[in-house]
């Protein structure tokens, strides 16, 4: 059994009835001029004149792929028989968004499956979806070019008060986790020292409860709790924090001796060990990496080293005895 009617006959292409042998005779000077490739495409076997019956193959530039039938056929009348072919992007271009929005991660091109997060300055939230995924040559969901930032409900409520508080006449009072937190607010990963457990909590609820003097609640990181280095460090940081002499409020968080509050992001960022000031009487005797020698470090150095995920064993609080 053969799927070809004329077994063994030379065919031009699978979807054509005409065979090479049935093509009309070619005059010496007849043929087709070079065809125009689709946008972002080029002709692989490029030349000035093509013989009748000759095919040209359309290829696409890097970052694009052919969609449709990529061969053009030179016809006896000097024209090209061409199906619908186009070069479609296989990557997404960094979207053009309003200047107020920040794109993370910030790249020129994104591969299929990669996602971006849009964020707003402090006190504002994205007025629409904040997460987008590259699918084929476009973003899903589509990114509206009118997408902007709007005042965060938390910020609206709080007026001139601190986070977790609301304006009541001329004074600031704590928000009620039940009454004032029915609106959507971003998820935070939070640690409860009483129950010795971590859980995901809406930001509004966490801040309201913290304001109501629930000192056992500690911010771990923005986003829902997920196993990994961020959670691991958040828990270790909470343990170290009890000995910190510095406790500086910073957005949802509190910064400690080994951290600085970033003015632009309102997040606590670990210092690097050389940035630690020597002062302070919170000392620890430690062993670094695989070293056998003991070293006295201050709490800032201990915090920065652990934050950087460098191997260090805390032997005991206070100076090394040796």
């Amino acid at each position: 059994f053969s799927i070809m009617e004329n077994n063994g006959q030379p065919c031009i292409n699978d979807d054509e009835e005409m065979k090479e042998v049935d093509l009309p005779e070619i005059e010496a000077d007849s043929g087709c001029p070079q065809p125009v490739p689709p946008e972002n495409g080029f002709i692989r076997n490029e030349k000035q004149l093509y013989l009748v019956g000759e095919d040209v193959e359309i290829s696409c530039l890097t970052g694009f792929e052919t969609v449709g039938y990529q061969y053009f056929r030179c016809l006896p009348d000097g024209t090209w028989r061409q199906g619908d072919v186009e070069c479609q992007r296989t990557e997404c271009i960094k979207p053009v968004v309003q200047e107020v929005l920040t794109i993370t991660p910030f790249q020129r091109l994104y591969r299929i499956g990669e996602s971006i997060e849009l964020t707003c300055p402090k006190g504002f939230v994205v007025a629409g979806p904040s997460r987008y995924t590259c699918q084929g040559n476009s973003w899903t969901p589509p990114i509206s070019n009118s997408l902007t930032c709007e005042k965060d409900t938390l910020t609206k409520l709080k007026g001139h008060c601190q986070l977790g508080q609301k304006q009541s006449g001329s004074e600031c009072i704590c928000m009620s986790p039940e009454e004032d937190c029915s609106h959507h607010s971003e998820d935070l990963c939070v640690f409860d020292t009483d129950s010795n457990d971590y859980f995901t909590s809406p930001a509004c609820k966490f801040l309201a409860e913290k304001c109501l003097n629930n000192q056992q609640l500690h911010f771990l990181h923005i986003g829902s709790c997920q196993d990994g280095r961020q959670l691991e460090w958040g828990l270790e940081r909470t343990r170290l924090s009890s000995n910190s002499t510095k406790k500086e409020s910073c957005g949802y968080d509190t910064c400690y001796d080994w951290e600085k509050c970033s003015a632009s992001t309102s997040k606590c960022v670990c210092l690097l060990p050389p940035q630690c000031f020597k002062g302070g009487n919170q000392l620890y005797c430690v062993k670094m990496g695989s070293s056998t020698s003991e070293k006295t470090l201050n709490i800032c150095e201990v915090g920065t080293i652990r934050c950087a995920n460098r191997k260090m064993e805390i032997l005991h609080p206070g100076k090394c005895l040796a």
């Epitope: 600085k260 690097l272 940035q275 630690c276 000031f277 020597k278």
Partner: antibody, heavy 118, light 112 residues
């Protein structure tokens, strides 16, 4: 006001030695890590070495390990860089730098030029 | 070592014009706890470098707010909104997310 003044630079032959000094004032010298950063003629910047408060921990870039030694004398408020087995690629202006909570190299001296040439 | 590639190498601008300098890293500068140690320095002619921006987007002490930093991962930008004559010099980006600390080759800003 934080002030860092480098000295000790000069012309030296390949294989030779030189000792740079950085006199610090305007802050409590022994409370800070200190560093050396260099800049080749018409070139970019390159971190060289860092030392902790009391000199018990030192860190070097790979290309100078075993040849350069960073040290300090807290009583004299002075940072040093002993450079041995000098090579032509060590030709640069050497800056002394102090960190702050903002950055590793927040305060810089005016630099001292080291030329390694035969 | 992490390579920081700055573009353009030279910028020739007129006072009041806004400019951007790009700094691209050979690997992500975002560490596993979410911190990015990227800095911008300006070295004015005949002077030592001075800190402009730290931690990607925080303004250094005493730095005019016409300077701003942005970016994440491997792509970072320094923007000067309305260049002034005193802004001439070489701009360097520097990373401290990975040892050893490394600097970009610099971008020279000159006034037309």
């Amino acid at each position: 006001e934080v002030q860092l003044v480098e000295s000790g630079g000069g012309l030296v032959q390949p294989g030779g030695s030189l000792r740079l000094s950085c006199a610090a004032s305007g802050f409590s010298f022994s409370d800070y890590y200190m560093a050396w950063v260099r800049q080749g003629p018409g070139k970019g910047l390159e971190w060289v070495a860092t030392i902790n408060y009391d000199g018990s921990s030192t860190y070097y870039r790979e290309s100078v390990k075993g040849r350069f030694t960073i040290s300090r004398d807290n009583a004299k408020n002075t940072l040093y860089l002993q450079m041995n087995s000098l090579r032509s690629e060590d030709t640069a202006t050497y800056y002394c730098a102090r960190p702050s909570t903002e950055a590793l190299f927040a305060y810089w001296g005016h630099g001292t030029l080291v030329t390694v040439s035969s | 070592d992490v390579v920081l590639t700055q573009t353009p190498l030279t910028l020739s601008v007129t006072p009041g014009q806004s400019v951007s300098i790009s700094c691209r890293s050979s690997q992500s500068l975002l560490n596993d706890v979410g911190n990015t140690y990227l800095y911008w320095y300006l070295q004015k002619p005949g002077q030592s470098p001075q800190l402009l921006i730290y931690l990607v987007s925080d303004l250094g002490s005493g730095v005019p707010d016409r300077f701003s930093g942005s970016g994440s991962g491997t792509d970072f930008t320094l923007k000067i909104s309305g260049v002034e004559a005193e802004d001439v010099g070489v701009y360097y980006c520097m990373q401290a997310s990975h040892a050893p600390y490394t600097f970009g080759a610099g971008t020279k800003l000159e006034i037309k």
